[in-house]
């Protein structure tokens, strides 16, 4: 019962986490215009992974997609890749874990197969969560670096030289959604891995096996005969998977009182 609960809870937590990762990836508020200590503007800028937006105090919002791949910063491309890898792994993990759920009967699937699938999905959720957390953290680091660079520019006496207002960006809502979602997916994955241990049959004891001799009837009761569990030579079923280290080579602006009425 506890195993089923752990597995079910792990699935639900991971599902919420992956939904959050998808939401964060699609959100436009990865970075938002810093309003603190800035002249109060009637225009608010915010940016996502796929487009940048401007919301005017009039209520008019205009968003423009990044219609170039080559012209984008490598870091942004890396964040995009990490988030997409996280979503893909998470989605596959969800698919696998549905079939692995103990409460769902599919044909004559053995518990051992379900244990395998539970561990697979658990590992996928863990990697998915780590990808999301890494992606969001890389973006946050990029923001912090740019923030202090733009702050330095504001105070280096370049006033008259600069033709645009130095817009500083700070953490947007998507970052917090991404961190929380990544954490949930990670926790869900760990729970699935824990559930896997309970699902895997340790041993089967044949307490009484009757042997009928041709002559007289003798009941033979061996002490603890261990039968094979269907995992080939792996009778103890201690290690179904090795960790499966993965290498991912492809991974490389209503309002507040200031934002306009």
């Amino acid at each position: 019962m506890a195993v089923t609960a752990c597995q079910g809870l792990g699935f639900v937590v991971s599902l919420i986490g992956i939904a959050g990762i998808i939401a964060a990836t699609c959100m436009d508020q990865w970075s938002t215009q810093d309003l603190y200590n800035n002249p109060v503007t009637a225009v608010f800028n915010y940016q996502g992974l796929w487009r940048s937006c401007v919301r005017e105090s009039s209520g008019f919002t205009e968003c423009r997609g990044y219609f170039t791949l080559l012209g984008l910063p490598a870091m942004l491309q890396a964040v995009r890749a990490l988030m997409i890898v996280g979503i893909v792994l998470g989605a596959i993990g969800l698919l696998v874990s549905i079939f692995a759920l103990k409460c769902i009967r599919i044909g004559s699937m053995e518990d051992s197969a379900k244990a395998n699938m539970t561990l697979t999905s658990g590992i996928m959720f863990i990697v998915s969560g780590l990808c999301a957390i890494a992606g969001v953290s890389v973006f946050a680091n990029m923001l912090v670096t740019n923030f202090w660079m733009s702050t330095a520019n504001m105070y280096t006496g370049m006033g008259g030289m600069v033709q645009t207002v130095q817009t500083r960006y700070t953490f947007g809502a998507a970052l917090f959604v991404g961190w929380v979602a990544g954490g949930l997916t990670l926790i869900g994955g760990v729970m699935m891995c824990i559930a896997c241990r309970g699902l895997a049959p340790e041993e089967t004891n044949y307490k009484a096996v009757s042997y009928h001799a041709s002559g007289h009837s003798v009941a033979y009761k061996p002490g603890g005969f261990k039968a094979s569990t269907g995992f080939g030579s792996n009778t103890k079923n201690k290690k179904i998977y090795d960790g499966g280290a993965r290498t991912e080579d492809e991974v490389q602006s209503y309002p507040s009182k200031h934002d306009y009425v």
Epitope: T167, Y254, V261
Partner: antibody
């Protein structure tokens, strides 16, 4: 078509208050901000503040902070501007205007002349 | 506050001739987010409220004749009337729509020579 109809002219004593109304029509009242701009006789335009009729959020020109109060009544679909502690230099034509894209004002009321005189 | 300085204060131009009004802002009105300049031009005739001519420094409001055009970026802006008509006699104002408080220029009076 979009129209903003303002209340009639007012004559006030120094130290008193005036409340000017602005009733827009031809569009959804809560969808656009209403700004207030004044123009002293023979002078230029001066922005006083703006209100979001949907949320009631306001932004004011600090020059008028404390003296001006902008409100909006959704039921009567009317915006109001109240200016207190009137002085002779507050004598002006007061306009309400609808804020649109570019934060520009595309439709204006006909203006309300407020005369402050003892 | 952002100071908007218009020049000249008044301008006399012959009918059919070009009229040019300048507006200078004390700070850049160019928003880096959408590369738009938050400057608006209005026309005000005696006894009337102002009329919106141009927003985003160069976008003509619908119904405004194409002889009116806006240009400039950052701090320096220009309103041009390519061929002055009698009905264009008015006072023209520029407005900062980027920083609060939203401020207007002092106005430029356009007359017929």
């Amino acid at each position: 078509q979009v129209q903003l109809v303002q209340s009639g002219a007012e004559v006030k004593k120094p130290g008193s208050s005036v409340k000017v109304s602005c009733k827009p029509s031809g569009y959804t009242f809560t969808n656009y901000l209403i700004d207030w701009v004044r123009q002293a006789p023979g002078q230029g335009l001066e922005w006083m503040g703006g209100i979001n009729p949907g949320s009631g959020d306001t932004v004011y020109n600090e020059k008028f902070q404390g003296r001006v109060t902008l409100t909006a009544d959704k039921s009567s679909m009317t915006a109001y501007m109240e200016l207190s502690s009137l002085r002779s230099e507050d004598t002006a034509v007061y306009y309400c205007a609808r804020r649109v894209r570019g934060n520009s004002f595309d439709s204006w009321g006909q203006g309300t002349l407020v005369t402050v005189s003892s | 506050d952002i100071v908007m300085t218009q020049s000249p204060d008044s301008l006399a131009v012959s009918l059919g001739e070009r009229a040019t009004i300048n507006c200078k802002s004390s700070q850049s009105l160019l928003n880096s987010g959408n590369q738009k300049n938050y400057l608006t031009w209005y026309q005000q005739k005696p006894g009337q409220p102002p009329k919106l001519l141009i927003y985003w420094a160069s976008t003509r409001e619908s119904g405004v004749p194409d002889r009116f055009s806006g240009s400039g970026s950052g701090k320096d802006f220009t309103l041009t009337i390519s061929s002055l008509q009698a009905e264009d006699v008015a006072v023209y104002y520029c407005q900062n729509n980027y920083f609060y408080p939203l401020t207007f220029g002092g106005g430029t009076k356009v007359e017929i020579k």
